[in-house]
């Protein structure tokens, strides 16, 4: 699995966004875990990266992900000064030049190497479901969220707002 060293290769240069054409409003490193405290880890296998959901051994280092936050104006008729109607989009990158992608056809979450500007499949709308829990909704497929299925990340369709609190689409972000 990647350790912190893989992410430290990041330069301070901020990524461009295909959403707004501007830099992210903020970026930070965090480890990603499920609502039930399983870690999201990334491993190189057969020249491609696999994503796992697993219990870490005691003292095993958690993989870190670079989260880049972008503002996106929601296409709506809301009035205001441009502040209203904004959503937070996020991209997730566990190692240099690789980003989480939504594969809507396969209902899967994959790590793809790609150049900027990033494709829309790499952007997710950030939802805060609890004060310290988040969910990631596909920009390319509203109502579809990153979730956990059979110890892997998958795309899960959420039919109603009640189901937004389903534990398998909730994730915790932490700096440890």
């Amino acid at each position: 699995a990647f350790g912190i060293s893989g992410v430290q290769k990041y330069t301070r240069a901020l990524h461009d966004s295909s959403i707004t054409g501007i830099s992210p409003i903020t970026e930070y490193l965090a480890s990603l875990s499920t609502y039930n405290d399983q870690s999201i880890t990334f491993a190189l296998e057969d020249e491609s990266y696999e994503i796992y959901v697993e219990d870490l051994k005691k003292d095993e280092k958690k993989d870190k992900v670079l989260l880049s936050y972008y503002e996106s104006q929601h296409p709506s008729n809301e009035s205001g000064d441009g502040v209203d109607g904004k959503m937070l989009m996020v991209t997730l990158s566990p190692t240099k030049d690789f980003w989480l992608h939504a594969n809507n056809k396969e209902h899967s979450v994959e790590l793809h190497k790609c150049e900027k500007p990033l494709p829309d499949q790499a952007f997710f709308v950030l939802h805060n479901m609890h004060s310290n829990c988040v969910s990631f909704e596909c920009k390319t497929d509203p109502g579809v969220f990153i979730g956990v299925k059979d110890n892997h990340l998958a795309l899960i369709k959420v039919d109603s707002s009640e189901n937004l609190c389903t534990e398998n689409i909730l994730f915790k972000l932490s700096e440890t």
């Epitope: 409003i25 903020t26 930070y28 965090a30 936050y69 503002e71 929601h74 709506s76 809301e78 009035s79 205001g80 502040v83 209203d84 109607g85 904004k86 959503m87 937070l88 709308v125 950030l126 939802h127 805060n128 479901m129 609890h130 004060s131 310290n132 707002s161 009640e162 937004l164 609190c165 700096e175």
Partner: antibody, heavy 121, light 106 residues
Framework: EVQLVETGGGLVQPGRSLKLSCVAS????????MYWIRQAPGMGLEWVSS????????YYLDSVKGRFTISRNNAENTVYLQMNSLRSEDTATYYC??????????????WGQGTLVTVSS | DIQMTQSPSVLSASVGDRVTLSCKAS??????LDWYQQKVGEAPKLLIY???NLQTGIPSRFSGSGSGTDYTLTISSLQPEDVATYFC????????FGQGTKVEIK
Amino acid sequence: EVQLVETGGGLVQPGRSLKLSCVASGFTFSNYWMYWIRQAPGMGLEWVSSINNDGGNTYYLDSVKGRFTISRNNAENTVYLQMNSLRSEDTATYYCAKGRYYYSSYSFAYWGQGTLVTVSS
Amino acid sequence: DIQMTQSPSVLSASVGDRVTLSCKASHNINKHLDWYQQKVGEAPKLLIYFTNNLQTGIPSRFSGSGSGTDYTLTISSLQPEDVATYFCFQYNSGWTFGQGTKVEIK
């Protein structure tokens, strides 16, 4: 134009109840987290309570837990703060605020003008 | 719970001065920090969000910086209309305000 108008404040005796309302307009209310923040006379700001956009998750300052209840009616664009067992230390101007982003609990982009709650015998 | 500590409590400066306000968090807050301005008798107003992003309509003399636990609000050239109390606010874990810094004109 975004507007938040708080009502329901006033003078109340210790131990009694009060219900604050905040009517919102100028934005898609059901997409935003909403908040109550208070400010005791001459003091700083203190976050009191938060409610997510569909009302399913609520959060409270420790000192008001079990006494205050935040709720919302998305059909009426209104957020409420039911305050029970009021204490003198609850005396403050209570502000209603909305989040900056759809679905996210980040930043208070707009604030109401506040309503004063005075708890005194 | 995360505590936010602002310094100084009161800052007195002349018009045109560069003014720096400090905010320290008890834990890493990952740049999840805002600055609010409150003038006497008014509701607070968002100035800066996510550490260094200027809210729409706020003059460019205001800027924010910082990371981890240490954050700064800078007013590059203090104006009479900047007399107010400034609050930092974290939303990385729960929601917490600093106690405020009152800015006065000498």
